[in-house]
Interface confidence: low
């Protein structure tokens, strides 16, 4: 069983080490602010694949199984307060950067086999985000992007879980959003 | 077993709202996605949307986005449907159905009786 | 309204074999979403017939299979009884609406 756990950990590191490169890639790629509609777009065909599209809701149930805090909710109307329709995808792209990086990077050893798939997929939506920004002051969405950090963190392990649990949400938002 | 009971049948005015009620029983309700379609008469079946119970977050169909909202209380394993500015064509019976455990083949699995919502002014 | 087409109304005798088909495009059926198939009895709530494809829930007689090929599905329902008689749903995902369709709806009529 440890053998297995080892060798499924270390086929899961050398995925993970992958999107880890590309997330260090894309928050040091940082950039001078372009217009909103150039860079903040996804295409359609990122969600339209059927087997990431189910891995991603798998995932996202496999974590709700696993906490019993329903009362809390991360991505919801709340989040997209003051945020007009232009700024969301940027908003999105904030909340899938944490939620990579101190949700799913954090918790990459759980809900296997969910997880080695859906995290590089993730990861690759990420990057295609790095030059999204938006022109002017930003303040309102990192206050409302703030917030869900803080959730998580107050929680803890549980709050990971619940973003993880949210998963389908953020694949919705990110597709709502972005395309 | 598996149920799911809705709410009676209601008469509204055009403009106003309507809540429609779905209680679950028999198995656990926050694992399970529920879905809510609805039916015209003589018409055939349209989906409106989803909700994840667990998380409480809902998915809505393109159609109905800004007017309708799903809930739900996990206390009392109920899902709601609100239905805001009535206009005679949301005359229709509305059903609520779960979805099974994998989401690899996602469909309506068990479905409720259906709730008539008519609009007459 | 419906992104699935199904033909309005479909007819058999007793015994007889008939076949409903449900006809969508890349963005659903095409990109590889399951079909499922409902049967809606008069007055009744709609009853899951056959899923992912070609999956019969348990309770649904082996008269009842369904098949995808591209961009269409079909059910296929032999030894055709007159409790058979009632209107006939697919459904799928379809990526481009992120949400869950249905077809148009047939009505099966035993002679």
């Known amino acids: 069983m440890a053998a297995l756990q080892k060798s499924v950990s270390s086929f899961l590191m050398g995925t993970l080490a992958t999107s880890c490169l590309l997330l260090l890639a894309l928050l040091v790629q940082g950039g001078a602010a372009a217009p909103i509609s150039s860079h903040c777009r996804l295409d359609k065909s990122n969600f339209q694949q059927p087997y990431i599209t189910n891995r991603t809701f798998m995932l996202a149930k496999e974590a709700s199984l696993a906490d019993n805090n329903t009362d809390v909710r991360l991505i919801g109307e709340k989040l997209f307060h003051g945020v007009s329709m232009s700024e969301r995808c940027y908003l999105m792209k904030q909340v899938l950067n944490f939620t990579l990086e101190e949700v799913l990077f954090p918790q990459s050893d759980r809900f296997q086999p969910y997880m080695q798939e859906v995290v590089p997929f993730l990861a690759r939506l990420s990057n295609r985000l790095s030059t999204c920004h938006i022109e002017g002051d930003d303040l309102h969405i990192q206050r409302n992007v703030q917030k869900l950090k803080d959730t998580v963190k107050k929680l803890g392990e549980s709050g990971e879980i619940k973003a993880i649990g949210e998963l389908d949400l953020l694949f919705m938002s990110l597709r709502n959003a972005c395309i | 077993q598996v149920q799911l009971v809705q709410s009676g049948a209601e008469v509204k005015k055009p403009g106003a709202s309507v809540k429609v009620s779905c209680k679950a029983s028999?198995?656990?309700?926050?694992?399970?996605?529920m879905h809510w379609v609805r039916q015209a008469p003589g018409q055939g079946l349209e989906w409106v949307g989803w909700?994840?119970?667990?998380?409480?977050?809902?998915f809505y169909a393109q159609k109905f986005q800004g007017r309708v909202t799903m809930t739900r209380d996990t206390s009392i394993n109920t899902a709601y449907m609100e239905l805001s500015r009535l206009g005679s064509d949301d005359t229709a019976v509305y059903y609520c159905?779960?979805?099974?455990?994998?989401?690899?083949?996602?469909?309506?699995?068990?479905w409720g009786r259906g709730t008539m919502v008519t609009i007459s002014s | 309204q419906a992104v699935l087409t199904q033909p309005s109304s479909v007819s058999g005798a007793p015994g007889q074999r008939v076949t409903i088909s449900c006809t969508g495009s890349s963005s659903n059926i095409g990109a590889g979403y399951g079909v499922h198939w409902y049967q809606q009895l008069p007055g009744t709530a709609p009853k899951l017939l056959i899923y992912g494809n070609s999956n019969r829930p348990s309770g649904v007689p082996d008269r009842f299979s369904g098949s995808k090929s591209g961009t269409s599905a079909s059910l296929a329902i032999t030894g055709l009884q007159a409790e058979d008689e009632a209107d006939y749903y697919c459904?799928?995902?379809?990526?481009?609406?992120?949400?869950?369709?249905f077809g148009t709806g047939t009505q099966l009529t035993v002679l």
């Open positions: 159905a779960r979805e099974p455990e994998k989401f690899d083949s996602p469909n309506a699995e068990i």
């Open positions: 909700i994840n119970p667990y998380t409480g977050g809902a």
């Open positions: 028999g198995y656990t309700f926050t694992h399970y996605y």
């Open positions: 459904q799928s995902y379809d990526s481009s609406l992120s949400g869950y369709v």
